[in-house]
C-alpha cells in the first residue's frame, strides 16, 4: 500500500526557507521521489552584540553558525569550542556546516547550492491569496480578488496562511514556508519557540512542513536542559545570541 505521508505528526521535520525565500507542507513518514529541500538561516549576527555560545557540535549552534575552536578552523581540536558565524560564499571551509545557509563546502570553499535560488518561472505580479479569510468572498468563487487601480496590480502583503512565492510576499513577522505541497506565510519564530536544526546541511528527507527561521537576534540552539537527552529527542528552541 501507499506509504502514507503523515501530515499530522509532531515528528514531521520542519524546515526554514532559504535566504530570501522559499518554503513548505504535511505528512506521516513517506517515501517520496527525492526533492530539493531548502536550508534556511537566521539573519547574520553582527560582532557588536555577539555573545560566544559554548558548544560541542554544530547541532548546538544556530543554522547560521558552526561549532569550532575560536582560534582554529575545525571543530574537535582541543580547547573550548563556541558557535561561530557561518562563512559566506567563496570563504574557506572544512565542512558543510561552516558555510552559511544556501551554501555548501566544496574543495575547501563555500559554494552556492543549486537550490539556494528561487526557481525560474515565478510569477512577477504575485497576487496574494489569503487561505484563511476569503473562502466566503463574494467575488468569483471566493477565490482571490485582485485589487486593480488604473489597470495596475497593487500588492497587499500576505497574512498568515496566504499562499506565497517568497518571504517578501508575506507581511512583517512572517516568512514563506512549505505547508503540505504548497507554500504559505507562517510566523517567524519567537524566543523560546521550537525550531528545526538539521544534522547535516543538504541531507534532509522530505520536509512536508517547514517552520520559519528564528527572528532577528535569535538562533536555533539545543535547549540547555536537553543536553543530556538522547540525540533523537533533543529539543531546539530559538534563543538569544
Amino acid at each position: 500500500t501507499l506509504n502514507s505521508v503523515l501530515i499530522n505528526s509532531n515528528a514531521i521535520k520542519n524546515l526554514p526557507p532559504p535566504l530570501g525565500g522559499a518554503g513548505g507542507q504535511p505528512g506521516s513518514a513517506v517515501s517520496v521521489a527525492p526533492g530539493v529541500l531548502y536550508e534556511g538561516g537566521n539573519k547574520y549576527q553582527t560582532l557588536d552584540n555577539y555573545q560566544p555560545y559554548p558548544c560541542a557540535e554544530d547541532e548546538e549552534c544556530g543554522s547560521d553558525e558552526y561549532c569550532s575552536s575560536p582560534s582554529r578552523g575545525a571543530a574537535g581540536v582541543g580547547g573550548v569550542q563556541i558557535c561561530l558565524a557561518c562563512r559566506k560564499r567563496r570563504k574557506r571551509c572544512m565542512r558543510h556546516a561552516m558555510c552559511c545557509p544556501g551554501n555548501y563546502c566544496k574543495n575547501g570553499i563555500c559554494m552556492p547550492s543549486d537550490h539556494s535560488h528561487f526557481p525560474r518561472g515565478e510569477i512577477e505580479e504575485s497576487i496574494i491569496e489569503n487561505l484563511g479569510n476569503d473562502h466566503n468572498a463574494a467575488a468569483g468563487d471566493g477565490y482571490p480578488r485582485r485589487t486593480t487601480l488604473t489597470s495596475k496590480i497593487y500588492h497587499t502583503k500576505g497574512q498568515e496562511g496566504s499562499v506565497c512565492l517568497r518571504s517578501s510576499d508575506c507581511a512583517a513577522g512572517l516568512c514563506c514556508a512549505r505547508h503540505f505541497w504548497s507554500k504559505i506565510c507562517k510566523p517567524v519564530l519567537k524566543e523560546g519557540q521550537v525550531c528545526t536544526k538539521h544534522k547535516r546541511k543538504g541531507s534532509h528527507g522530505l520536509e512536508i512542513f517547514q517552520r520559519c527561521y528564528c527572528g532577528e537576534g535569535l538562533a536555533c540552539r539545543i535547549q540547555k536542559d536537553h543536553h543530556q537527552a538522547s540525540n533523537s529527542s533533543r529539543l531546539h528552541t530559538c534563543q538569544r545570541h
Epitope: A22, D141, V163, F209
Partner: antibody
Framework: QVQLVESGGGVVQPGRSLRLSCAAS????????MHWVRQAPGKGLEWVAV????????YYADSVKGRFTISRDNAKNTLYLQMNSLRAEDTAVYYC???????WGQGTLVTVSS | DIVMTQTPLSLSVTPGQPASISCKSG???????????LYWYLQKPGQPPQFLIY???NRFSRVPDRFSGSGSGTDFTLKISRVEAEDVGIYYC?????????FGQGTQVEIK
C-alpha cells in the same frame, strides 16, 4: 477568473499512452501543490498523484506508480499527467485539484478500451 | 490510509425537513497548525464535485447557509437545516491531512 481546465482525455487502447493537461488561471499557480484525482464510472473518487509547488517532490498512488508521471510548468501555469501502459481500470474522469484552498476542474474523461 | 466512514448511505427527506450525515475518520484530522482538514462536497450526476464545507465548518462561497458542518478529531457531521429539491445528489466527506486523500463512500440524498 479562478479556474482549472483539464484537457487531453479520449479513447485509447490498453498499453498505450495519453497525456492530460490542466490549465490554471486566476491564482498564483506556482505557490500551490497540485493533485490529480480520478473517478471511475459509477464509483467514488480516488486520489492519483501530487506534485509540490516547485515540481521537486512527487508522490503517487500505488495503483499508478511506475506508469503515471505528474509534472508541471509554472511558467505556463499548467499541470500534466503522463499516463503510460494504460489499463482498462484506468478508465475514469480525471480531475486536477488545487490543495489548501480546494479547487477542482471540470474533469476530462479517459476511456481505455480495445 | 485513513478510512472515512459515512452513515447513512442513503437518505430520503421531505422538502423543508432537516437532514444529517455523519462521517468518521480512522484517525484524527486535526493538524499541528490547528486546522482540521475535513471537507464536504456534493456530486450530482455527470458533474464534478461541488465543495460545500472546508475545514469542518466553513462554508465555501455561494453555499447556502442551510448547510453547516460540525465536529472535531474523528467525528464530523453535515447538516442541511431545510432540504430543498436542488440538494439531491451524493454527499461525500474527504480528508486531505494525509496522503492519499481519502473519501467517504457517499450518502445518497433524495427527496420523498
Amino acid at each position: 477568473q479562478v479556474q482549472l481546465v483539464e484537457s487531453g482525455g479520449g479513447v485509447v487502447q490498453p498499453g498505450r499512452s495519453l497525456r492530460l493537461s490542466c490549465a490554471a488561471s486566476g491564482f498564483t499557480f506556482s505557490g500551490y501543490g497540485m493533485h490529480w484525482v480520478r473517478q471511475a464510472p459509477g464509483k467514488g473518487l480516488e486520489w492519483v498523484a501530487v506534485i509540490s509547488y516547485d515540481g521537486n517532490d512527487k508522490y503517487y498512488a500505488d495503483s499508478v506508480k511506475g506508469r503515471f508521471t505528474i509534472s508541471r510548468d509554472n511558467a505556463k501555469n499548467t499541470l500534466y499527467l503522463q499516463m503510460n501502459s494504460l489499463r482498462a481500470e484506468d478508465t475514469a474522469v480525471y480531475y486536477c485539484a488545487r490543495e489548501l484552498r480546494v479547487l477542482w476542474g471540470q474533469g476530462t474523461l479517459v476511456t481505455v478500451s480495445s | 490510509d485513513i478510512v472515512m466512514t459515512q452513515t447513512p448511505l442513503s437518505l430520503s427527506v421531505t422538502p423543508g425537513q432537516p437532514a444529517s450525515i455523519s462521517c468518521k475518520s480512522g484517525q484524527s484530522l486535526l493538524h499541528n497548525d490547528g486546522k482540521t482538514y475535513l471537507y464536504w462536497y456534493l456530486q450530482k450526476p455527470g458533474q464534478p464535485p461541488q465543495f460545500l464545507i472546508y475545514e469542518v465548518s466553513n462554508r465555501f462561497s455561494r453555499v447556502p447557509d442551510r448547510f453547516s458542518g460540525s465536529g472535531s478529531g474523528t467525528d464530523f457531521t453535515l447538516k442541511i437545516s431545510r432540504v430543498e429539491a436542488e440538494d439531491v445528489g451524493i454527499y461525500y466527506c474527504m480528508q486531505s491531512i494525509q496522503l492519499p486523500w481519502t473519501f467517504g463512500q457517499g450518502t445518497q440524498v433524495e427527496i420523498k
